[in-house]
């Protein structure tokens, strides 16, 4: 009779997680006599997977009944695959003893699972930023295999560039894990902006993942502040109103000072919303001008989302005659609305971005 | 190690049963056939039956098929032969073998069981 | 049914010298290209032992002076140079089929 030949047909087998995994086997001689074993690896630290003699392998089946007379296909089937069982397995020969002997292997089978990752989770910056300024979003799914893997990062629905993409571990893996991050240019029209991690593996089918974060999250949008006074009333009173416009979160406390004192503090809430997702605000205070002797210096005092405060002065000139009805009292805007929101005095507040 | 370990000797009065056990250890029980052999005194060998464990097919030899009954029990891994009706020429060592190699032969075998049958 | 008759029914061979056993089969035992032929040794008072299997291929831990030959019908078990402790029944056994044995050779020292 010819030499006994171990085979094992196929170089490498790709299962999906969850399935089943077929590693054919089958031997070209019904002599020597002896078992067959299956192993993972090679050498001392070999794995044993399943022994026709004995031993307990509740996930391994052999395909053909083992005591089938002339039997000479060793196929075993493994259920219920994970990442883990990655690896190469060898169909091994032994001779009947005392014990058995090793007598020959296949050349092996290498078994790789195909994993899916794991949905994509966008995280993005621990504190908000303003417009113009960079954040960063990161972006990462775990558990795939094989390695190859891609990875698009989008602001709505147009495609971005300026990112870092990582796949780890370098090294041959049972899964691997994907973590990428994008550098995005904040605008003050990102109220409303998304931005969408996109992940393609093979095991997807051309279905990608998609994790997404709200730039909402990680936007400020700082408020214009404008300071205005109506025409004077007939009771000697003047109405200033203080428009606080497109400022992002609704967080926001006013402050109305008169002559550097605390007049009212107001904290905004339930504002309506403007397209762009940002919020307006106006404050109103009535000073009676004739309780004033000297020019009454008004100021609106803005702490949005925790900043430091934003100022905007005005003064109301008392006239000479200032009870007489109708008399020409002035008002004078001598605040700046500039975005930086300097305050008149600009040596108590600055504004930082 | 495979150890195949019979039950002790039997006495039976003609027309009796008898029921002799064979314990396996040192392999996968349900994946090699136990066979069944006699030999009387001073006589050759004579095949029984055979059974597979994992399923209970069996295979009889006509001589038997109608007295002998085989069956296992895989929780305890053993292997049992029944014999009805026994008559004197029933008189015999009963042996139980494993075929390691599906083979159908005799690869390990116990130390036997003696079954006399006289009134 | 196979019957399988072995010649002679005993032998006596002096120590040293070859012992021949025949076994022949009512009809060919040869399929899927084996000849499914083994031999047995039993020595007394205990079980037999696997000596042979698929006509010529010697079982695990059998000294090497046993060896088995033949095709078809007609099969040879041949001890190369008899010791003392080869003194035994041997028997012949077919598995074409449902199983037989022979009906054993007993061999002897001279």
């Known amino acids: 009779e010819e030499e006994l030949q171990v085979i094992q047909p196929e170089k490498s087998v790709s299962v999906a997680a969850g399935e089943s995994a077929t590693l054919n086997c089958t031997a070209t001689s019904l002599i020597p006599v002896g078992p067959i074993q299956w192993f993972r690896g090679v050498g001392p630290g070999r794995e044993l997977i399943y022994s026709q003699k004995e031993g307990h392998f509740p996930r391994v089946t052999p395909v053909s009944d083992p005591t089938k007379r002339n039997n000479m296909d060793f196929s075993i089937r493994i259920s219920n695959i994970t990442p883990a069982d990655a690896g190469t397995y060898y169909c091994v020969k032994f001779r009947k003893g005392s014990p058995d002997v090793e007598l020959k292997s296949g050349a092996g089978t290498e078994l790789s699972v195909r994993a899916k990752p794991s949905a994509p989770v966008v995280s993005g910056p621990a504190v908000r930023a303003t417009a113009e300024h960079t954040v960063s979003f990161t972006c990462e799914s775990h558990g795939f295999s094989p390695r190859d893997i891609t990875l698009k990062w989008f602001k709505n629905g147009n495609e971005l560039s300026d990112f870092q993409t990582n796949v780890d571990p370098a090294g041959k893996s049972v899964s691997y894990s994907i973590r990428s991050t994008a550098r995005v240019v904040l605008t003050r029209r990102d109220v409303h902006s998304q931005v969408i991690c996109e992940v393609a593996h093979v095991t997807l089918q051309g279905d990608p993942l998609r994790g997404t974060a709200n730039l909402s999250e990680a936007i400020r949008v700082p408020p214009f502040l404008e300071v205005t006074q109506q025409s004077m009333r007939a009771d000697n009173q003047v109405n200033v109103t203080c428009q606080v416009t497109k400022f992002y979160p609704q967080r926001l406390q006013l402050t109305w000072l008169e002559n550097g004192n605390v007049s009212r503090t107001e904290m905004a809430s339930a504002l309506p919303e403007n397209k762009d997702g940002t919020y307006n605000w106006t404050s109103w205070l009535l000073v009676n001008v004739s309780a004033h002797r000297d020019d009454v210096k008004l100021t609106c005092q803005v702490e949005h989302d925790g900043q430091p405060a934003v100022n905007k002065s005005f003064s109301v000139k008392v006239s000479a005659h200032p009870k007489e009805q109708g008399s020409n009292t002035a008002a004078e805007n001598t605040g700046t609305n500039e975005r930086d929101y300097k305050d008149d005095d600009d040596k108590h507040h600055h504004h930082h971005h | 190690q495979v150890q195949l370990v019979q039950s002790g000797a039997e006495v039976k009065k003609p027309g009796a049963s008898v029921k002799v056990s064979c314990k396996a250890s040192?392999?996968?029980?349900?994946?090699?056939?136990i066979n069944w052999v006699r030999q009387a005194p001073g006589q050759g060998l004579e095949w029984i039956a055979m059974?597979?464990?994992?399923?209970?097919?069996?295979h009889y030899n006509q001589i038997f098929k109608d007295r002998a009954t085989l069956t296992t029990d895989t929780s305890t891994s053993t292997a049992y032969m029944e014999l009805r009706s026994l008559r004197s020429d029933d008189t015999a060592v009963y042996y139980c073998?494993?075929?390691?190699?599906?083979?159908?032969?005799?690869?390990?075998w116990g130390r036997g069981t003696l079954v006399t049958v006289s009134s | 049914d196979i019957v399988l008759t072995q010649s002679p029914d005993s032998l006596a061979v002096s120590l040293g010298e070859r012992a021949t056993i025949n076994c022949r089969a009512s009809?060919?035992?040869?399929?899927?290209?084996?000849?499914?032929i083994f031999w047995y040794q039993q020595k007394p008072g205990q079980p037999p032992k696997l000596l042979i299997y698929?006509?010529?291929n010697r079982d695990s831990g059998v000294p090497d002076r046993f060896s088995g030959s033949g095709s078809g019908t007609d099969f040879t078990l041949t001890i190369s140079s008899l010791q003392a402790e080869d003194v035994a029944v041997y028997y012949c056994?077919?598995?074409?089929?449902?199983?037989?044995f022979g009906q054993g050779t007993k061999l002897e020292i001279k």
């Open positions: 073998a494993m075929d390691y190699g599906s083979l159908y032969a005799m690869d390990y």
């Open positions: 059974i597979d464990p994992s399923d209970s097919e069996t």
């Open positions: 056994q077919h598995s074409r089929e449902l199983p037989t």
């Open positions: 040192g392999y996968t029980f349900t994946n090699y056939w």
């Open positions: 698929l006509a010529s």
């Open positions: 009809q060919s035992v040869r399929s899927s290209g084996y000849n499914w």
